[in-house]
């Protein structure tokens, strides 16, 4: 079956199976070090 891995937010396909948000937000803090 067709996967929708990491599909773009511009596409009608779902990104859910990729495990990555369609347009991830920038983290608001820096890790120490």
């Amino acid at each position: 079956s067709e996967t929708t891995t990491g599909t773009s937010s511009n596409s009608s396909q779902s990104t859910s199976n990729s495990g990555l948000a369609p347009n991830p937000t920038n983290a608001t803090t820096k890790a120490a070090g």
Partner: antibody, heavy 115, light 112 residues
């Protein structure tokens, strides 16, 4: 069957360059964001770079430590993604995996940066 | 960057017994679409990582239902109902909500 096969690792001196490639089969490559992730004993698993789709104008993202030194690119006609690594540092040493999202991973290729 | 903290670092379990791994994130992983992009991976010795769970609790195809994922916001848990020999390896959580994507340090599951 989904396959992601990396190539191009090896030994390189600090300041040198190396290009990694990954060939993909088993899913629609042109519809998939592609990523490079590396693994080292010191840093564990670390996401390195991402390239999005043609419809996104092949937008790219990089982790801060490689920005300006690494360039990710893709060739949808060949279902391949590459990582051009320049001005390499010893801390870039590790196993480099190409992945599609978090779901599919290649077997990895080892880069050693050492004098 | 979002820091992913896994505990314990190592776990030694008798076959047939349960196991539990915790993953805590320094920021909420709830995305604006209402989904939470928290994944669990297993890296068996000498192999590349393999995903077990995505979106906190969804099992990948072929993953046994003895694995369950739960949690929300910043606190997540992977549970193995009854550990089997094939479960040994290092388990990682990884978040895909915030850029850059970040991984936990790993939990090594050993068989007693």
């Amino acid at each position: 069957e989904v396959k992601l096969e990396e190539s191009g690792g090896g030994l390189v001196q600090p300041g040198g360059s190396m290009k990694l490639s990954c060939f993909v089969s088993g899913f629609t490559f042109s519809n998939s964001w592609m990523n490079w992730v590396r693994q080292s004993p010191e840093k564990g698993l670390e996401w390195v770079a991402q390239i999005q789709l043609k419809s996104d104008n092949y937008a790219t993202r990089y982790v801060e430590s490689v920005r300006g030194r690494f360039i990710i690119s893709r060739d949808d006609s060949k279902s391949s993604v590459s990582l051009q690594m320049n001005n390499l540092r010893t801390e870039d040493t590790g196993i480099y995996y190409c992945s599609s999202g978090t779901d599919y991973w290649g077997q990895g290729t080892t880069l050693t940066v050492s004098s | 960057d979002v820091v992913m903290t896994q505990t314990p670092l190592a776990l030694s379990v008798i076959i047939g017994q349960p196991a539990s791994i915790s993953c805590k994130s320094s920021q909420s992983l709830l995305f604006s679409n209402g989904k939470t992009y928290l994944n669990w991976l297993l890296q068996r010795p000498g192999q590349s990582p393999k995903r077990l769970i995505y979106l906190v609790s969804n099992l990948d195809s072929g993953v046994p239902d003895r694995f369950t994922g739960s949690g929300s916001g910043t606190d997540f848990t992977l549970k193995i109902g009854r550990v089997e020999a094939e479960d040994l390896g290092v388990y990682y959580c990884v978040q895909g909500t915030h850029f850059p994507y970040t991984f936990g340090g790993g939990t090594k599951l050993e068989i007693k």
